[in-house]
């Protein structure tokens, strides 16, 4: 191509040093942060994902920064403010960490946030077969419907001993969410 | 996540007693309740008993004939297994596990969140 | 007590093949009989609930039959990651105490060739 050193190639502050092979008459040293035969590419370093938690990546050019999500700080946002380090649940709920949040795990009666509002434990429905669900002061207590017995109705009273129970509403797994 | 974790396992004389702790996180006990299930070495399953912390029951397993004990504690967040008057036969690994009770008014009775297990060994 | 019984002990089968485990309840269990897979050093894993309801996350290659006092499990298009052993629990009502209790089968070793 005929092009060297005197023509200035190197773009970017690159420095220009003549080949030593006859077929490539100069190469270009390019500064930090940008790459190419002539320095003309930026080098994209927030490709390497620096930023945890779910930053966000800035290449200033001098530096990078990261731009922390909500409950997360440090350099590349590497410590979680959200864990459960001095974090109160109400009416003895527990906390539970995971994926950079944390939440209570309340106990029976009570929800919300910090398990400080009073829960209807009926509303989750552990009565089956259509049982009527009663919150006591000692636990729940289910009224069986016709035809059910046992703690939360779950057993049939088949006096002909018929083997079949309703089934299970498709797709409904132990743990999905509520219907 | 839902998760148990069984601890308090170990080495125990034979008529000693030990109590074995289930830290639980990440479910409501409207629905679930937690089961203690027993596995000797190179054996089968052996259910031991449940809590069902809503109702305020417990059952057992006829076999345990009152040497062991399931509580509840601190807002039923730990569980717990009084085991009394061991022998060798009770040398085994003790897991604690979730019970799929009654989910929106659908009755399950599967056992589907198992911890680790901790093991007891009853020898003089 | 209701006694859960599991045939065969064992079985062995090629990759690619199927094996049937049975288990058959001393009472009528309606349909209250749930399969776990265990592998040696593990804690067991629940594979189907309720009879034939696949837990999530487990291939649709197990599937779980029966009602009343006996049950089936069936494992199509063996893999060598199937060799575990299989107990079959059941939930009944124990009418001389008037409460619901557990019971496991005593197992079934699957071997894969």
């Known amino acids: 191509s005929g092009v060297t050193c005197a023509d200035g190639p190197c773009f970017n502050g690159g420095l220009c040093v003549g080949g030593a092979d006859p077929d490539s008459a100069y190469i270009c040293h390019c500064p930090p942060g940008f790459q190419g035969s002539n320095c003309e590419k930026r080098v994209d370093r927030c490709s390497l994902q620096p930023c945890r938690n779910g930053g966000l990546c800035l290449d200033l050019g001098h530096a990078l920064r990261c731009r922390c999500r909500a409950g997360f700080a440090g350099p590349r946002c590497e410590h979680d403010l959200d864990d459960c380090a001095g974090r109160a649940c109400a009416n003895g709920g527990t906390c539970v960490e995971g994926g950079g949040a944390h939440r209570c795990s309340c106990a029976l009666g009570f929800g919300g946030r910090d398990c400080r509002e009073r829960a209807d434990p009926c509303a989750a429905r552990p009565c089956a077969h259509g049982g009527r669900c009663y919150a006591h002061f000692s636990g729940l207590v289910c009224a069986c419907a016709p035809g059910y017995m046992g703690a939360r109705c779950e057993f049939p009273v088949h006096p002909d001993g018929a083997s079949a129970l309703p089934a299970a509403p498709p797709g409904l797994r132990p743990g999905d969410p509520q219907r | 996540q839902e998760q148990l974790v069984e601890s308090g396992g170990g080495l125990v004389q034979p008529g000693g007693s030990l109590k074995l702790s289930c830290k639980v996180s990440?479910?409501?006990?409207?629905?679930?309740?937690v089961s203690w299930v027993r596995q000797a070495p190179g054996k089968g399953l052996e259910w031991i008993g449940y809590?069902?912390?809503?109702?305020?029951?417990?059952y057992y397993a006829s076999w345990v004939n009152g040497r062991f004990t399931i509580s509840s504690h601190n807002a039923q967040n730990t569980l717990y297994l009084q085991l009394n008057s061991l022998t060798a036969a009770d040398t085994a690994t003790y897991f604690c596990v979730r019970v799929a009770l009654v989910v929106a008014g659908v009755a399950y009775y599967g056992m589907d969140v198992w911890g680790p297990g901790t093991l007891v060994t009853v020898s003089s | 007590d209701v006694v859960m019984t599991q045939t065969p002990a064992s079985v062995e089968a090629a990759v690619g093949g199927t094996v049937t485990i049975n288990c058959q309840a001393s009472?009528?269990?309606?349909?209250?009989l749930s399969w776990y897979q265990q592998k040696p050093g593990q804690p067991p894993k629940l594979l189907i609930y309720?009879?034939?309801t696949l837990a999530s996350g487990v291939p649709s290659r197990f599937k779980g039959s029966g009602s009343g006092t006996q049950f089936t499990l069936t494992i199509s298009d063996l893999e060598c990651a199937d060799a575990a052993t299989y107990y079959c629990?059941?939930?009944?009502?124990?009418?001389?105490?008037?409460?619901?209790?557990?019971?496991f089968g005593g197992g079934t070793e699957v071997v894969v060739k």
């Open positions: 990440g479910f409501d006990f409207s629905n679930y309740g």
């Open positions: 809590i069902d912390p809503a109702f305020g029951r417990t």
């Open positions: 629990q059941s939930y009944y009502y124990s009418s001389g105490s008037s409460y619901g209790a557990f019971a």
């Open positions: 009472q009528n269990i309606y349909s209250y």
């Open positions: 309720r009879t034939s």
